[in-house]
Structures are given as structure tokens and as C-alpha cells.
């Protein structure tokens, strides 16, 4: 690829790079839906070392429209020059390219979480992977939003060290016999558009009851 020549390919694909469960996932959609590939191959190189395009092993001849690049793309400053090839059988239908910089292009998907409601508090259990690479921390902060009767409260728990392992946060001083909904998301220091989790709701038991309520999924 010559970076200073006219663009390598057309723009028949839309790419998105996301941090999903602290893994770098590249996904794509085709703009022209009349083209239906049977499989894809993803290749990339680094702009600073313009070597031959390298096939991503777990994304060669794949039928999926996403690829896990966690072990391939580590630098937030490098330009990753990406080429996606779409095939039908042995015929190449298209190839499209895009340059990514993780620090600019990464979006952050919300972590998995569960809630358990008690009389006057909710336990929010956020699931992080057991180990998270330093370069995938991205200056992220966890935000837990509590909603009840149209009022939204933001909680920003302080997480000691990096975001790894499970984390429990208690939303306290709640009103018994009231419905509460909780959403969890990761906020970037740059406040790029956040992706909030779907709400999980629970009706807290009335005051005299002490057993936990089932959280509505």
C-alpha cells in the first residue's frame, strides 16, 4: 500500500472498533447489501513500518463480521492500516480499507453487570475480566446510573488499581417498595459519546421484609 497515492480501495464498508469486555473488537457492515460474501479475510499493517499486509490469523476466511484484535493492536498512537476482503467462494467480491488510531477511534461498550435489590439498597456487581492489559485501560472511569421516578443519579465509584476482576458497588439510602433501574457504562476522559448498558430494574421489597428481591433481567 502506498499511503500517499490515491485511496487504496473504495468505501463499501463501515468499520467500528470497540472495547468489549476490555478486548479490542473490530466489526464491519457492508454499505451495499446486494453483495453477500460467504466469508471475509482481514489484513493489516502499521503505517510507521509499511511492511506487507499481514493476515489476522483468527480472521482469515471467517464468516463472522467482527474480529478480535486485542493481541494484534497494542499501541494507541500507531496508525493501523486495515484491509477487509470479502469473498464468495473463491471469488473476491470487494476489498475496502480504513486507518485506525485506537486513541481516536475506539468506542467503549458497557461491562456486564447484575443487580440485587434489598430493602433500602442495591448491590451492583460489575464483571471485569481477571486481567486487563495496561494499554487497554484508556483512562476509563466506571459510571453507575440509578433511576427512579424520573430522577437520575450518577455514581462514579473509585476503583483502586485497574479495572480487573469483579467489582461490587452498593447504592444505598434507597426507599423501600420502590422501583429502581440501573445502567452501567464506561466514561472516557475525553467524554466521547458513551454507550450505556440497557437498564436493569428491581422493585425493592417493603420495609418489613429483609430478604433480597429478584432483579428483573
Amino acid at each position: 500500500i502506498s499511503y500517499d497515492s490515491p485511496d487504496y480501495t473504495d468505501e463499501s464498508c463501515t468499520f467500528k472498533i470497540s472495547l468489549r469486555n476490555f478486548r479490542s473488537i473490530l466489526s464491519w457492515e457492508l454499505k451495499n447489501h446486494s453483495i453477500v460474501p460467504t466469508h471475509y479475510t482481514l489484513l493489516y499493517t502499521i503505517m510507521s513500518k509499511p511492511e506487507d499486509l499481514k493476515v489476522v490469523k483468527n480472521c482469515a476466511n471467517t464468516t463472522r463480521s467482527f474480529c478480535d484484535l486485542t493481541d494484534e493492536w497494542r499501541s494507541t498512537h500507531e496508525a493501523y492500516v486495515t484491509v477487509l476482503e470479502g469473498f464468495s467462494g473463491n471469488t473476491t467480491l470487494f476489498s475496502c480499507s480504513h486507518n485506525f488510531w485506537l486513541a481516536i477511534d475506539m468506542s467503549f461498550e458497557p461491562p456486564e453487570f447484575e443487580i440485587v435489590g434489598f430493602t433500602n439498597h442495591i448491590n451492583v456487581m460489575v464483571k471485569f475480566p481477571s486481567i486487563v492489559e495496561e494499554e487497554l485501560q484508556f483512562d476509563l472511569s466506571l459510571v453507575i446510573e440509578e433511576q427512579s421516578e424520573g430522577i437520575v443519579k450518577k455514581h462514579k465509584p473509585e476503583i483502586k488499581g485497574n479495572m480487573s476482576g469483579n467489582f461490587t458497588y452498593i447504592i444505598d439510602k434507597l426507599i423501600p417498595n420502590t422501583n429502581y433501574c440501573v445502567s452501567v457504562y464506561l466514561e472516557h476522559s475525553d467524554e466521547q459519546a458513551v454507550i450505556k448498558s440497557p437498564l436493569k430494574c428491581t422493585l425493592l421489597p417493603p420495609g418489613q421484609e429483609s430478604e433480597s428481591a429478584e432483579s428483573a433481567k
Epitope: Y3, D4, S5, P6, D7, Y8, F15, M47, S48, R74, S75, T76, H77, E78, A79, V81, H98, N99, F100, W101, A103, I104, D105, E134, E135, D139, S189, D190, Q192
Partner: antibody, heavy 119, light 112 residues
Amino acid sequence: QVQLQQSEAELVRPETSVKVSCKASGYSFRNYLIEWVKQRPGQGLEWIGVINPGSGNTKYNEKFKGKATLTADKSSSTAYMQLSSLTSDDSAVYFCARDGYYLGTMDYWGQGTSVTVSS
Amino acid sequence: DIVLTQTPLTLSVTIGQPASISCKSSQSLLDSDGKTYLNWLLQRPGQSPKRLIYLVSKLDSGVPDRFTGSGSGTDFTLKISRVEAEDLGVYYCWQGTHFPYTFGGGTKLEIK
């Protein structure tokens, strides 16, 4: 050769907005980031933000959020910076710059656009 | 935000003599990818900035080899082995490791 041609100087009224352009030539526009930098008269340089023209994704200096909006038009190989609710503090020369192979390394700079805010 | 402190503020040098500019950072500029995104530029009077050095010590093409960049962590230096008349202007260091990028206050090089 790589060139970044910026729009002409602007004299604008307070509380209005202005859009500065930066036309790129000599390279594939969508394959490199465009950065924007502010320089007030006789002062140093301040980073405003960066855009990936290929994706339209941006990152801003917190200080310029709500003040500057970065966009890019791939068809004309032009990056834009809109400055809103202008005050005398916005009077400055604004530079666009292309990032090299790495983010944050600005290898080529435009000639600058002077914006003067005055009633 | 990272603060970059440049010294001296002004440098008066005789043509043919060496010059040295220091740039100290309030925090390490070593990125998790092992690179240090510390760069130097020159802004000649009435002109736009021109990058001289990137990644601490890599010289831009067309920049004379009398310019050298060095340093690591928080302490960086730009040296000119023999100053020439075309070198006058304001020199800035800037860091691209941490957002927001920040610039040093500048060092004005004058010819004696």
C-alpha cells in the same frame, strides 16, 4: 508534496461563529489525522483537537469542548474547524497540521488562519 | 495536564557556536507502547511551525544534521552543534503521549 492550505483571515463580531478550512493535497486525505492548534499573539501554542477524516471521529482538549467543532469532507479533502460564541479570547492564529505515522507528531502544518474578534 | 518547561526563555548565540535548549516534563512521556512522543518544532518569524524532530531524536527529512534531540522520561534536550543565521526563531517542544497534547513555552533563539 504535502500541502495544507488554510482559509483567509477573518474579522468577526463577538457572539458569532466562524468556520476555518484546511484543504489537504499531495497525499491521501482520509489516511492521516488532522490536528488543530491555537496561537494567540505573542504567545505559545495550544492544542485544540484532532479528527480522523476517514471515520469522522474526534478528540478534543477539554478546554475547547463546546467552543470548537471539528469536521472533515473526504470528497474535497478539506478539514474544518468551527468556533462558536466568539469572544476576544478567541482572537488568535489557528493552524491545522497533519499527523505523521504516529498520533501527536504533526509533521506538516498549514500557514495559519488569523481570526480577529472585534465589535 | 502535562506541563512542559523550556529553558532558557531566550538564547543569544554567535553564528558557528553551539546552542542547547532544555525541555522538562511534569510527568514521564514514555508511553505504554515503549515510545516517547516528544517532538521539537521551529517557528521562524512570521511563519508557520516546522517540525524538526519527533520521537525524541528522529530528525525530519531536510533538517540539517547539526540538530540533535536526546533525553528520556521527563528530561529532553535539543542541541544545535553550530548555529546558522537561518536557525533564528522560536523553538517549541511538545508532547503527544498524553491527552491533551501540550507545548513548552518556547525558546527564542537570537543571533548575536
